[in-house]
């Protein structure tokens, strides 16, 4: 059979069974793509949008990997990546996804590795990516790339029907906790990369989390703000006990200032102020005493002034008493005129 | 970790055809190809030819006319037959396999047997 | 088919010396290079893929550069056990082919 032929600006490879367009200018895929494809590189172009059918088997029934970084993609549609019967390996990284939608992949799609670095930096492609996650068409990934995407927090849930997950890298975000993450169903996950980031401790829920998954054998948190006050004397338990994290000899405090620079796995209880009830900062407690004793000041003072001018007070009430009463009659003696027929005339024609 | 394990005869006479089977252990089978390399006594490396998960083969067209390569999924093995071999056939032959790493797409035979010594003698 | 030249076909060096061995095509072969080390004895090893990513295991000393026609291998520090014969081979056309061969020995 004679060779396919390969797209004018590309460069392909049937040995390789590679086809590479890189810094090509596309607006669009290909449409002539060879069959025996099998790794595609569309990198540094400007596509703009991946519509239904851009890429689809028969055509590319062998394509396997496909990398798409950094083609200045804003939107993933429906149905784009659903026809692919073989695809393994997705890299999305660099783009600046707006809308991921939610049936990008169809129902289910074999996809084992999908990187997204850079390309949820807004949320609305982040909350398709949750929402599709959750639809469990990616039952299939073993590795999840979400570095260097800003997070601040992830979507509830989003983790939850990933069974299949190894590898995930949360890496060079912004994440404040871990609160509203649930790791439970990623039996299978073995590495968790959360450097750079910035969390200031990890609860016991978490923590008991992570107890709970057996393959989890490397956990990645260096260069986060640890708070190093009572709140995380069960982290630096639980630090002490595991051997689930990279180079946790080097995890230090950041906050606060007295205690910055403080290897974690040196901290003791008594430095931590573990005396006053766990979560609520020292100087927290002593704002709402302060507070207590001022309100219950001026209340005292409200009841000696009430007390002291009680004559008063008790000649103030009468007067009211006395004024209601005198009203309440004039509305009594309105109501017998208007009730006897006799009257209805004098009443309608009067003052009274 | 994805290892090969080869056998077959090392002492054949001229004319025979060379059989030799390669085993993969620890790892999927599909989606790889499946390639043999020989290397006669004090010489360089010669492709010899290679096969992919779907059947599809690849010879060197220097030899394609005496060799064959199969697989037999269900064993996770495949095979090479070198027809009518003479002395210049004498070599160590190597099965080899394509893996790779995520996001790199054009992979190096990163995973090889032990060799087999085939000697071609009368 | 495409014919993968290296050189030198020896190069004297000792310990701690920076080796730099060279492949070049006889046609464009893109990045699809591949280069390997074999120790007597012993089934050859990949070091570098793609021209220039490092195989799993492969100590940074190792690094590949070059596209088309003219690639090159840098050992940065020889080691001892860097003492060995080097191969590169293209995955560009059909037949696979591969270099002659460098030896690096000890001076």
């Known amino acids: 059979q004679p060779p396919a032929a390969c797209p004018a600006p590309c460069e392909c490879s049937e040995a390789a069974k590679t086809v590479k367009c890189v810094n090509k200018n596309l607006t669009e895929v290909p449409p002539d793509l060879p069959p025996y494809v099998r790794n595609l590189f569309i990198t540094g172009n400007r596509l703009g949008r991946l519509p239904a059918g851009a890429l689809s088997a028969p055509r590319l029934a062998e394509l396997g990997s496909l990398n798409l970084s950094g083609n200045h993609l804003r939107a993933v549609e429906a149905g784009a990546l659903a026809a692919l019967p073989a695809l393994r390996q997705l890299d999305l990284g660099g783009n600046p996804l707006a809308e991921l939608s939610p049936l990008a992949f169809g129902r289910a799609s074999p996809l084992e590795e999908l990187a997204l670095r850079g390309a949820l930096r807004e949320q609305g492609a982040l909350l398709g990516l949750a929402d599709l996650l959750q639809a469990g068409a990616l039952r299939n990934l073993s590795r999840l790339e979400l570095a260097d995407n800003g997070l601040l927090l992830l979507p509830t849930g989003m983790l939850g029907a990933l069974p299949a997950l190894r590898h995930l890298d949360l890496s060079n975000n912004s994440l404040v906790g871990l609160r509203n993450v649930s790791f439970q169903g990623l039996v299978r996950l073995q590495s968790l990369n959360l450097s750079d980031n910035s969390l200031g401790v990890l609860r016991n829920g978490t923590l008991a989390q992570w107890r709970g998954l057996p393959a989890l054998r490397r956990i990645s948190l260096s260069h986060n703000t640890w708070v190093c006050d009572c709140a995380i004397e069960d982290m630096v338990a639980w630090l002490k006990e595991s051997d689930q994290v990279e180079g946790k000899e080097a995890l230090s405090c950041a906050f606060p200032e007295k205690m910055a620079g403080r290897a974690l796995l040196k901290l003791n209880t008594s430095e931590l102020n573990c005396s006053a009830p766990v979560d609520v900062p020292s100087q927290l407690q002593t704002s709402y005493v302060f507070l207590g004793i001022v309100l219950a000041l001026i209340g005292a003072i409200f009841l000696l002034v009430l007390y002291l001018n009680r004559k008063g007070i008790k000649k103030w009430m009468h007067n009211i008493r006395d004024a209601c009463r005198d009203h309440m009659e004039g509305y009594h003696y309105r109501y017998e005129i208007n009730a006897d027929p006799r009257l209805t005339n004098l009443s309608s024609n009067s003052d009274v | 970790q994805v290892q090969l394990q080869q056998w077959g005869a090392g002492l054949l006479k001229p004319s025979e055809t060379l059989s030799l089977t390669c085993a993969v252990y620890?790892?999927?089978?599909?989606?790889?190809?499946w390639t043999w390399i020989r290397q006669p006594p004090g010489k360089g490396l010669e492709w010899i030819g290679e096969?992919?998960?779907?059947?599809?083969?690849n010879y060197n067209p220097s030899l394609k006319s005496r060799v064959t390569i199969s697989v037999d999924t269900s064993k996770n093995q495949f095979s090479l037959k070198l027809s009518s071999v003479t002395a210049a056939d004498t070599a160590v032959y190597y099965c080899?396999?394509?893996?790779?790493?995520?996001?790199?797409?054009?992979?190096?035979?990163?995973?090889w047997g032990q060799g087999t010594t085939v000697t071609v003698s009368s | 088919e495409i014919v993968l030249t290296q050189s030198p076909a020896t190069l004297s060096l000792s310990p701690g010396e920076r080796a730099t061995l060279s492949c070049r095509a006889s046609?464009?072969?893109?990045?699809?290079l591949a280069w390997y080390q074999q120790k007597p004895g012993q089934a050859p090893r990949l070091l570098i893929y793609?021209?220039?990513n490092r195989a799993t295991g492969i100590p940074a000393r190792f690094s590949g550069s070059g596209s088309g026609t003219d690639f090159t291998l840098t050992i940065s520090s020889l080691e001892p056990e860097d003492f060995a014969v080097y191969y590169c081979?293209?995955?560009?056309?059909?037949?696979?082919?591969f270099g002659g061969g460098t030896k690096v020995e000890i001076k």
């Open positions: 793609d021209a220039s």
């Open positions: 096969i992919d998960h779907s059947e599809s083969t």
């Open positions: 620890g790892g999927s089978f599909s989606g790889y190809y």
């Open positions: 081979q293209q995955r560009s056309n059909w037949p696979l082919t």
């Open positions: 080899a396999g394509w893996f790779g790493e995520l996001y790199h797409y054009y992979y190096g035979m990163d995973v």
């Open positions: 046609q464009s072969v893109s990045s699809y």
